[in-house]
């Protein structure tokens, strides 16, 4: 079941999923100039058996001025450098990902993908936090979400950690104010996961996580 | 209570467009999807899209994604689908519904007819 | 997509009478939703996540099913139950509906 409302917002912090539960999809959305081809899924999809799990549909994007064709324009040195750097923390990723019954890793990248995934999870998904560079955790519990569902709406558990400044005093600041609203269901953002491209801060922060490598930003 | 009103019927004619407004109450509007729902006289229901309100995030069905719109206004609690090109196959009632899982609450229907 | 299959497109009942509508996806789904609409009014959530019924909906009103396979049941058909019924699902998008049961009087 599609979870109809997006992981909590927390200050100074992206999230990740480790794996993505059977069911969820991923939009095939390509970069400007580019476009999904005519006969392509919207969508790639978890979907597996009890001994394995993949994604469904491959995305394929091509030159929006082509006319039915698939032929793919050269790259220009930077979108070389951008592609490059996706592979790379691809591998990164699926060297760092376990497995789990039931999940899919991260999809490889595809041809002119767009800079920008945007997931649907569903019901049980959970996602990881993690304090950008520059901002140290202050954990009352668990650093995670995870999307359940109660009398048929979904709503995402409240991750416990508190971002704070490398300068700021260390004692233990205030709770951020929850990302839910008064009738009990978290605010409806996107879940949109950013793909960041600058290698060399990406390093940085893959060396400090303990579980898995961030290659993602919550937008 | 929560609430969804919709704006009243509208007749165009072909190849024009129309915008269709549906304002909330009774709960925090960024706090929920808004999907649209579409019914053409005398048949069933078919989902068109959402929008996140806070972000002004949408997902179309394929279907209908060079055909509406959805936008969102926070500072009004309303949500728009802009239907464009009509023709007279988009006659129909359309509805917003409030996400978050189920379609909990909906709103009465505009019923839009092109007609020349 | 998704495609669902509702059977009976119609079916005419009496006050009192058992009724079973059957909702079948071409792939399988986590759950089935029902709404009830009835004429120029908006639909109605009936029953969520395949058995629950909504707030304020008669136990009559009765939903089962796994996988590919789901019913709505009514156990005995009030007066009031005379409407359309729609299948749902949200597993996946697009997210789509059934092409409807309406149960008439008979």
């Known amino acids: 079941e599609l979870c109809d409302d997006d992981p909590p917002k927390i200050t100074h912090a992206t999230f990740k999923a480790v794996a993505y539960k059977e069911g969820t999809m991923l939009n095939c959305e390509c970069k400007r100039g580019f476009r999904r081809i005519k006969s392509g899924s919207p969508y790639m999809l978890c979907t597996g058996n009890s001994s394995h799990s993949s994604w469904d549909n491959q995305c394929q994007c091509t030159s929006s001025a082509a006319r039915n064709t698939t032929k793919q324009v050269t790259p220009q040195p930077e979108e070389q450098k951008e592609r490059k750097t996706t592979e790379m923390q691809s591998q990164m990723q699926l060297a760092d990902q376990v497995s789990l019954p039931g999940h899919c890793r991260e999809p490889p990248p595809w041809e002119n993908e767009a800079t920008e995934r945007i997931y649907h999870f569903v019901v049980g998904q959970t996602v990881y936090y993690q304090c950008v560079q520059g901002y140290r955790a202050l954990h009352r519990g668990p650093a995670e979400s995870v999307c359940k569902m109660t009398h048929g709406k979904t709503r995402w558990t409240q991750p416990q950690l508190i971002c704070t400044g490398e300068t700021e005093p260390s004692q233990f600041p205030g709770e951020e104010e929850p990302q839910a609203s008064p009738d009990g269901l978290p605010e409806s953002e996107t879940s949109r996961l950013v793909t960041t491209t600058d290698f060399r801060i990406q390093t940085e922060v893959a060396a400090t996580m303990e579980t898995f490598i961030f290659t993602t930003e919550y937008q | 209570q929560v609430q969804l009103v919709q704006s009243g019927a509208e007749v165009k004619k072909p190849g024009s467009s129309v915008k269709v407004s549906c304002k909330a109450s009774?709960?925090?509007?960024?706090?929920?999807?808004m999907h649209w729902v579409r019914q053409a006289p005398g048949q069933g229901l078919e989902w068109m899209g959402y929008?996140?309100?806070?972000?002004?995030?949408?997902e179309y069905n394929q279907k209908f994604k060079d055909k509406a719109t959805i936008t969102a206004d926070e500072s009004t609690n309303t949500a728009y689908m802009e239907l464009s090109s009509l023709r007279s196959e988009d006659t129909a009632v359309y509805y917003c519904?409030?996400?978050?899982?189920?379609?909990?609450?909906w709103g009465q229907g505009t019923l839009v007819t092109v007609s020349s | 997509d998704i495609q669902m299959t509702q059977s009976p497109s119609t079916l005419s009942a009496s006050v009192g009478d058992r009724v079973t509508i059957t909702c079948s996806a071409s792939?399988?789904?986590?759950?089935m939703h029902w709404y009830q609409q009835k004429p120029g009014k908006a639909p109605k959530l009936l029953i969520y996540?395949?058995?629950e019924l909504a707030s304020g909906v008669p136990a009559r009103f009765s939903g089962s099913g796994s996988g590919t396979e789901f019913t709505l049941t009514i156990s005995s058909l009030q007066p009031d139950d005379f409407a359309t019924y729609y299948c749902h699902q949200r597993s996946t998008y697009p997210l789509t509906f059934g092409q409807g049961t309406k149960v008439e009087v008979k």
């Open positions: 009774g709960y925090t509007f960024t706090s929920y999807r």
């Open positions: 792939s399988s789904i986590s759950y």
């Open positions: 996540t395949t058995s």
């Open positions: 519904a409030r996400g978050g899982g189920v379609f909990d609450y």
């Open positions: 929008i996140s309100p806070r972000k002004g995030y949408t």
